[in-house]
Interface confidence: medium
């Protein structure tokens, strides 16, 4: 089940066969980018 919040690495954060580039292309705002990288880096 879910509940965790920290990403082990960029590769682990990619789902639905998406590439990092495709995710970047669909993040629509500064807030979206900030949130994505906040989770990606494990909030450190």
């Amino acid at each position: 089940g879910g509940g965790g919040s920290k990403h082990k690495c960029v590769q682990n954060s990619l789902v639905n066969n998406e590439t990092l580039e495709s995710i970047m292309n669909t993040l629509e705002s500064e807030e979206d980018f900030r949130k994505y990288f906040y989770y990606l880096e494990g909030s450190k």
């Epitope: 879910g2 919040s5 920290k6 789902v15 979206d32 949130k35 994505y36 906040y38 989770y39 494990g42």
Partner: antibody, heavy 121, light 107 residues
Framework: QVQLQQWGAGLLKPSETLSLTCAVY??????HYWTWIRQPPGKGLEWI?????????NYNPSLKSRATISVDTSKNQFSLKLSSVTAADTAVYYC???????????????WGRDTPVTVSS | DIQMTQSPSSLSASVGDRGTVTCRAS??????LNWYQQKPGKAPKLLIY???SLQSGVPSRFSGSGSGTDFTLTISSLQPEDFATYYC?????????FGQGTKVEIK
């Protein structure tokens, strides 16, 4: 075990400011976004906005001009202020934790107990 | 905003029946779709995330499927505690939006 405890004024007059606070007990405050969601009587759920421990926020554009979410990391608390309330803001308000397992794969996995707010003259 | 539309709005069923709730997104949200259960006077509870992943502690009779714009929540054999309102929610983009809910009632 992580718990969310929320509180705030339950009865407001039109044009006043709604103020709610949610405290996080027993778990990590960083590493998550913390969210406010509301539910008008007999209706569905509406996402208000969210904040992380750094103070970065996202808001629902439908409320952005009136909603302010803030954080107090020293107390593991976050708060919602909603200005110029009307009867349409009458709802049950929830605070919630957002969990994440992957990019854009986030979900509300822990909720506080409801805080009913009524706006009436 | 991404609009989420659930059907039916209410579902009458008996204990042991199979229950199915559908959710349609107004645009492609891939599998960024979550399902919640809410009982009267209680906060919603996460059941399914990422369209098909079962949240820890949720009984295996609950399952989710779908991708793109069409999603399904299935309860394989309804139990008395399953009679509640179910909401879908997209996490593809802000503002995060919910379906209007499906109330599963005892026939």
């Amino acid at each position: 075990q992580v718990q969310l405890q929320q509180w705030g004024a339950g009865l407001l007059k039109p044009s006043e400011t709604l103020s709610l606070t949610c405290a996080v007990y027993g778990g990590s405050f960083s590493g998550h976004y913390w969210t406010w969601i509301r539910q008008p009587p007999g209706k569905g759920l509406e996402w208000i906005g969210e904040i992380n421990h750094r103070g970065n926020t996202n808001y629902n554009p439908s409320l952005k001009s009136r909603a302010t979410i803030s954080v107090d990391t020293s107390k593991n608390q976050f708060s919602l202020k909603l200005s110029s309330v009307t009867a349409a803001d009458t709802a049950v308000y929830y605070c919630a934790r957002e969990g994440s397992l992957a990019a854009r794969l986030w979900f509300f996995d822990l909720w506080g107990r409801d805080t009913p707010v009524t706006v009436s003259s | 905003d991404i609009q989420m539309t659930q059907s039916p709005s209410s579902l009458s069923a008996s204990v042991g029946d199979r229950g199915t709730v559908t959710c349609r997104a107004s645009q492609n949200i891939r599998t960024y779709l979550n399902w919640y259960q809410q009982k009267p006077g209680k906060a919603p509870k996460l059941l399914i995330y990422a369209a098909s992943s079962l949240q820890s502690g949720v009984p295996s009779r609950f399952s989710g499927s779908g991708s793109g714009t069409d999603f399904t929540l299935t309860i394989s054999s309804l139990q008395p505690e399953d009679f509640a309102t179910y909401y879908c929610q997209q996490s593809y983009g802000t503002p995060y939006t919910f379906g209007q809910g499906t109330k599963v009632e005892i026939k």
